[in-house]
């Protein structure tokens, strides 16, 4: 019946409605059905929310920052039904609500809780800074605070630095990782603990390839089973890291199952793609080839980031021409 | 059951100011809209006042409206009319009356009344 | 704000007869109409609410009716406890105007 919103039931007549920032939500409220309904729902037993009595809407007296943003289930209030639906919720709207609602055989008032949460999609980033290599977890707008929880190899790390900024509305928090000189496999959890909702980035890096000038080298690139679920939505993103910034080579998406090639001599396999295998063919290698190749898998649950080092060297005859 | 006790009645000098109070027992008093009504003894009935179940809207009649203040205070079960500048026609009885719900519907119940008489 | 007027002001009728009064509003109300009665030094009991629905335990021979503008409360056949003065009241929005009252009694 309530699709927008989850409810976590506690007593005293008390429910917990929990919405996500900007999105509709509803909150519930039910009576004994009787003739002439009155329903008053308010803000902090102070805020007036939505007013309707006599058949009708009265809302001359809704705070300002309700309008434009309530409505009753107006066909279903004959069957008890005098629950709120409320559009784009924002932080500002968290707290009590009361819903009384009277008719000519009884008065009864209900409590709803709103707690509103934020989780934009977190992302994993590598990058270089002069001659050190970071990861980053960052989330742009989160609320409440999350957890972030970093391991190397599967082992919790403790060092867990968080840059936050907080604004009106959420924090943004970045947290960054050194792992210069680094082979290990990186992860790095962030949990929304009112959402119930965690994302998690995934780090490895493959050992080094030697190729020579004009061969082709393979680059593996497959979902840890794990977090990956193929019903999901994902992008997959090959690119090559060239004096400190990646150029996309090409990039695959799972919703229209489109790949998008930007450079020639990539290619992909159509059939591992269908067996989720993103590996990739790079044709005809030349000396400036040489680099880093990030594989980035990424969904709304997840990032996971597959790094390869590519060094091509002079072939024979290129050598014995200089 | 509902029971509604008004007092705070009596004679007063034009000009001057009384406050009635009405005692709520028998039901949810916080729930429910209060009006205060009253009648000329002999004549009819005349709306005075009403005010909702938490207070937050308050309607008068234009007879009385700025001289006259309805209020409640939930945590007492207590109804007031605080009647300023009186005049010889607010000689009245002064019913407190219950609401059907929060205070814009009809009346469901009457106290007995109390007589507020003004005279020089 | 809307005017109550209310036809007879009095009446006197005999045990049995059927009773007519009438209650009119300057402006259209819907069914928000409540009429009271009032007994001899006694205070006003709600007798019909939404302009037709009876408040529970009033005898069955009042009855009520109308919409809009016009409405009428009926005692269908007069007993000598229905002496009294009978209200309309109007409760679509403030202030809830009573009409003047229609006084009853016993030939």
């Known amino acids: 019946i309530f699709p927008l919103a989850f409810f976590i039931y506690v007593p005293m007549n008390e429910q917990i409605v929990i919405g996500r920032l900007d999105e509709d939500i509803i909150l519930p409220s039910s009576f004994e059905r009787g003739s002439e309904v009155v329903i008053h729902w308010k803000y902090q037993d102070s805020y007036k929310v939505h007013s309707y009595y006599k058949g009708s809407d009265h809302l001359e007296s809704q705070d300002p920052r309700y309008a434009n943003r309530t409505s009753l289930f107006y066909n279903e209030i004959q069957n008890g039904n005098a629950s709120l639906f409320f559009r784009r919720v924002s932080l500002l709207d968290e707290g009590i609500y009361t819903c009384y609602v009277g008719t000519a055989i009884q008065v009864i008032t209900n409590k709803v809780v709103l707690k509103v949460g934020v989780f934009l999609t977190p992302v994993m980033k590598y990058e270089k800074r002069n001659t050190n290599s970071f990861l980053i977890c960052s989330v742009l707008s989160v609320y409440p605070r999350p957890i972030i929880t970093w391991k190397m190899d599967n082992t919790p790390i403790s060092e867990n630095n968080m840059e936050e900024t907080g604004s009106l509305d959420s924090f943004s928090i970045n947290s960054p990782l050194n792992i210069t000189g680094s082979n290990s496999s990186y992860e790095c959890t962030i949990e929304n603990s009112l959402l119930k909702q965690t994302w998690t980035g995934r780090w490895t890096m493959k050992d080094g390839l030697h190729k020579m000038q004009s061969e082709h080298v393979s680059l593996s690139c497959q979902p840890v089973n794990d977090y990956f679920s193929p019903n999901q939505d994902f992008k997959v993103t090959w690119s090559r890291m060239k004096s400190g910034t990646f150029s996309v080579l090409a990039y695959y998406l799972s919703s229209s199952q489109n790949t998008i090639i930007n450079e020639s001599r990539f290619s992909w396999n159509k059939e591992l793609i269908n067996q989720s295998d993103f590996s990739m063919n790079l044709m005809d290698l030349n000396l400036s080839d040489s680099g880093e190749y990030l594989c980035n898998i990424s969904s709304d649950e997840y990032t996971l980031l597959t790094i390869h080092t590519v060094h091509v060297e002079p072939s024979q005859e290129t050598a014995s021409h200089n | 059951q509902v029971q509604l006790v008004e007092s705070g009645g009596g004679v007063v000098q034009p000009g001057r100011s009384l406050r009635l109070s009405c005692a709520a027992s028998g039901f949810t008093f916080s729930n429910y809209g209060m009006h205060w009504v009253r009648q000329v003894p002999g004549k009819g009935l005349e709306w005075v006042a009403v005010i909702w179940y938490d207070a937050s809207e308050k309607d008068y009649a234009d007879s009385v409206k700025g001289r006259f203040t309805i209020s409640r205070d939930n945590s007492k079960n207590t109804l007031y009319l605080q009647m300023n500048s009186l005049r010889v026609e607010d000689t009245a009885v002064y019913y407190c009356?219950?609401?059907?719900?929060?205070?814009?519907?009809?009346?469901?119940?009457w106290g007995q009344g109390t007589l507020v008489t003004v005279s020089s | 704000d809307i005017q109550m007027t209310q036809s007879p002001s009095s009446l006197s009728a005999s045990v049995g007869d059927r009773v007519t009064i009438t209650c009119r509003a300057s402006?259209?109300?819907?069914?928000?109409l409540a009429w009271y009665q009032q007994k001899p030094g006694k205070v006003p009991k709600l007798l019909i609410y939404?302009?037709?629905t009876l408040q529970s335990g009033v005898p069955s021979r009042f009855s009520g009716s109308g919409s809009g503008t016009d409405f009428t409360l009926t005692i269908s056949s007069l007993q000598p406890e229905d002496v009294a003065t009978y209200y309309c009241?109007?409760?679509?929005?403030?202030?809830?105007?009573f009409g003047p009252g229609t006084k009853v009694d016993i030939k």
């Open positions: 402006q259209g109300i819907s069914n928000y």
């Open positions: 009241q109007k409760y679509q929005s403030a202030p809830f105007t």
């Open positions: 009356a219950k609401d059907l719900i929060s205070g814009i519907y009809y009346v469901d119940h």
């Open positions: 939404a302009a037709s």
